[in-house]
Interface confidence: medium
């Protein structure tokens, strides 16, 4: 299953499969997740060790049992790969590290005014993997405002040094934020030249392309098909790079296929997994386990559940079958790809889906619609559960926010549907940041079912909660993921670090905002809230948030959107934006539906609708 726990002041002993330098434990964990054999990692921050060579050391580890002995090491951080963790799997890393210089090959230097601009330049440069920026207070005047774009053979820094007034970070290409754009074309009977950075065996060009996309130095590839003239080169996928970033030449060649990495695609990247099953094909590799199962799909599921399994072959040979069950060979290799691919067999083969991020991990005015006042712009993927509920009558407009809680479920406020109960007038946009990006061609979800709380009454503030079942399930991406739900009876007063997001008004008599806004707001006790709203009953099924002095709040157009809090290391949906007296007025906190109080209702409705819980439980 998915293991998310981090172990502070602990170091896993033994099991090393790779080591590198990373700026923090989270980046180390990401590298472990994407390494074919890494199950565990240990990270040594600068403060944890005097040995300069081991500072910022990230040690990737494997273990046949799935665990290793932990030894005490002050400052060290250890944890698990996020393989099998569904929507938590991502190669995107947005953090900027102050006082740190990430070393590598400096291939481009320019003057910029901010670290954000430097990161943008790196993201928009095909070869840039990470960068360093010297601030205006850097000790050497001639280097101030320098933006150094860098790469390295492994995609991680060759060294990391503590250095005042320097800020470093990674390209946001894995966040699907590159402005470069990508070539989706696959070129039949064409071979690319230039430098080979790696060689793996794949069953087709599409697997080859996905491997290229997630390889730190692959910009394009050439795949030799299973009928290529040289037998030893059949099914070989050559991952390639060049100085210019594009192939310097291409040669017409029968039974070859070439194409480009999709890392520079904007808004959408392929999943880092391969779901296709290949009939009549055997994948060779190190034997992990053999089990009797009924059908190739169960074999793939078995491989996916066994965390070390990378690929499998399901044999239909008579001697490998008993009644309806046949042998499922679970296999692995050093690089995650088969060591041999054989055609014309009585088997079917495929890959583990442990890196797929679509899995459901069960281990996130005066009482009128309430936008964010006093907030700031959000960035892509920052609040991936936020959706925009829009109504298309003669014109189309944003009316409310909502929160994605499962592949097919959105949680919002009941009052959003006051006077607009018809399912077919609603359009739900997920994975967006700017409302202005929505065109007639932008995909949207339609509503299959609106489930309004049975005790909600129009123009009353109680039970302001509704579930939307979407007509079709959504895939999880970097910009579209569910928020975890709280536990029933959670006490909101113990939450800290809470945020409200939405496209609503930025002042009481304002207008809908283009860019998704965010604001950090403290929770207020119900007793305090009741004092501020003496004409209304603040119930235990509500939660309030706001500053005594006002100035920051939700407002018209934010209704139905999320109030999320980072709690005991995880983001959770604490409230649904509901109502308030004006917006951001002094001593008039915003009032939110308290999600924890409705957990029974949410589970009952999401389960009874299709027999199985579809919402995101904490993971």
């Amino acid at each position: 299953g998915c293991l998310t726990q981090l172990y502070e002041n602990a170091f896993f002993r033994g099991g090393d499969v790779a080591s590198m330098y990373t700026p923090n434990a989270q980046y180390c964990q990401m590298r472990c997740t994407f390494h074919p054999r890494c199950l565990l990692f240990s990270f040594l921050p600068a403060s944890s060790i005097n040995d300069m060579e081991k500072r910022f050391g990230c040690f990737l580890k494997d273990s046949v049992t799935g665990t290793l002995p932990k030894v005490h090491r002050t400052g060290a951080v250890s944890g698990h790969s996020l393989k099998q963790c569904g929507h938590q799997i991502s190669a995107c890393h947005r953090d900027i590290y102050k006082g740190v210089d990430m070393r590598g090959v400096n291939f481009n230097v320019s003057k910029v005014s901010s670290v954000e601009e430097c990161q943008k330049r790196c993201t928009s440069n095909i070869r840039c993997q990470f960068f360093s920026y010297a601030t205006q207070t850097f000790h050497k005047a001639e280097y101030r405002n320098n933006c150094l774009l860098k790469y390295s053979p492994g995609g991680t820094p060759t060294a990391i040094k503590v250095l005042s007034n320097v800020e470093s970070g990674f390209s946001l290409k894995p966040c699907a934020l590159s402005e470069i754009g990508c070539h989706m074309n696959i070129f039949q009977h064409l071979a690319f030249s230039d430098v080979d950075v790696a060689r793996v065996l794949t069953p087709d060009a599409f697997v080859c392309r996905t491997i290229c996309t997630y390889h730190p130095n692959c910009l394009f590839f050439t795949f030799y098909t299973n009928v290529w003239k040289i037998e030893s080169q059949r099914n070989v996928c050559l991952l390639k790079t060049s100085e210019s970033g594009t192939p310097s030449s291409s040669t017409p060649q029968e039974n070859t296929i070439s194409g480009y990495s999709l890392l520079t695609c904007k808004r959408t990247l392929p999943e880092p997994c391969h779901s296709k099953i290949y009939p009549g094909v055997d994948f060779g590799g190190e034997e992990l386990n053999v089990t009797f199962v009924k059908g190739v799909n169960v074999c793939q599921e078995t491989c996916t559940k066994m965390i070390r399994c990378q690929f499998f072959t399901y044999s239909l040979l008579p001697e490998d079958c008993k009644e309806e069950k046949c042998k499922c060979f679970l296999r692995l290799s050093m690089d995650g790809s088969p060591t041999r691919i054989a055609y014309g067999t009585q088997g079917s083969s495929g890959y583990s889906l442990r890196l797929c991020n679509t899995g459901d991990n069960s281990v996130c005015t005066t009482k009128t619609s309430t936008r964010i006042v006093g907030g700031t712009n959000s960035s892509w993927g920052e609040w991936p559960w936020q959706v925009s509920l829009q109504v298309k009558l003669t014109a189309q407009r944003h009316l409310c926010g909502g929160s994605l809680i499962g592949h097919q479920w959105v949680l919002t406020a009941a009052h959003c549907f006051d006077g607009l109960p018809l399912q077919d007038v609603w359009r739900i946009y997920s994975g967006i940041l700017n409302l202005s990006d929505i065109t007639k061609d932008t995909p949207f979800s339609q509503i299959k079912e609106i489930i309004i709380h049975q005790n909600y009454k129009v123009s009353e503030g109680n039970h302001d909660i509704a579930l939307i079942k979407l007509q079709a399930p959504l895939n999880y991406t970097e910009f579209q993921k569910p928020i975890c739900l709280p536990s029933k009876g959670d006490t909101s007063t113990i939450y800290t670090n809470c945020w409200v997001t939405g496209w609503g008004f930025s002042k009481e008599k304002g207008e809908i905002q283009n860019i998704l806004q965010k604001v950090n707001i403290p929770l207020v006790t119900n007793e305090e809230c009741q004092k501020r709203y003496q004409d209304y009953k603040i119930t235990q099924r509500m939660v309030c948030a706001g500053y005594k002095e006002g100035g920051k709040d939700a407002c018209k157009g934010d209704s139905g959107g999320p109030l999320v809090c980072k709690h005991n290391g995880m983001w959770r949906l604490v409230g649904i934006t509901s109502w308030g007296e004006g917006c951001a007025r002094r001593e008039q906190p915003g009032v939110y539906t308290k999600v924890a109080e409705y957990m029974d209702w949410i589970l009952e409705k999401t389960q009874s609708s299709d027999g199985k819980a579809q919402m995101q439980s904490p993971a």
């Epitope: 536990s487 009876g489 113990i494 939450y495 800290t496 005991n568």
Partner: antibody
Framework: QVQLQQSGAELMRPGASVKVSCKAL????????MHWVKQTPVLGLEWIGA????????AYNQKFKGKAIFTADKSSRTAYMYLSSLTSEDSAVYYC??????????WGQGTLVTVSA | DIQMTQSPSSLSASVGDRVTITCKAS??????LAWYQQKPGKAPKLLIS???GLEAGVPSRFSGSGSGTDFTLTISSLQPEDVATYYC?????????FGQGTKVEIK
Amino acid sequence: QVQLQQSGAELMRPGASVKVSCKALGYTFTDYEMHWVKQTPVLGLEWIGAIHPGSGGTAYNQKFKGKAIFTADKSSRTAYMYLSSLTSEDSAVYYCTRPYGYPFAYWGQGTLVTVSA
Amino acid sequence: DIQMTQSPSSLSASVGDRVTITCKASEDIYNRLAWYQQKPGKAPKLLISGETGLEAGVPSRFSGSGSGTDFTLTISSLQPEDVATYYCQQYWSTPWTFGQGTKVEIK
């Protein structure tokens, strides 16, 4: 390594009050709740409640309201539980425990409180 | 409050035996269940949780299963160091509640 260091055993008279402390080491004290659990041979483990040192917010099991009060001192990274009007039923081992998500991943060594005339 | 009923209250088994402890909740707890091991004079230790499964460092002979109201902790091959009291705990609804414990001994 996350460590929770609790104060030593206490022998108290009925009607008195006691303050049990729990010092947190190895993590950011203000980011995680501190929960308190009571253990007796008869009733086993009972959840008393929790405090969030970052916000000062508290949650109590209804059964222990009026009996236990939680406080936290950010500067010393210490959480406290104050038990008042002690009776023999308050004799127990009291644990502080820190969750990851919801389950209790880290525990103090326990503080034995004995109430006896 | 949700009641957690554990059975048996104690058991005695031989080294290498398969041991099963059950925990029943008075209402659906939606997989929000943890199992703890407590040795005499020590604090409880988290073994398994409904969200992240087996804790790191916990031997793979321990496993948890179940859903709804019925849950099971299994020790596939009992070892001398497994002598302890085992508790289940629900964290679906406050107040969080524990089972009364199962004492495991070696014959």
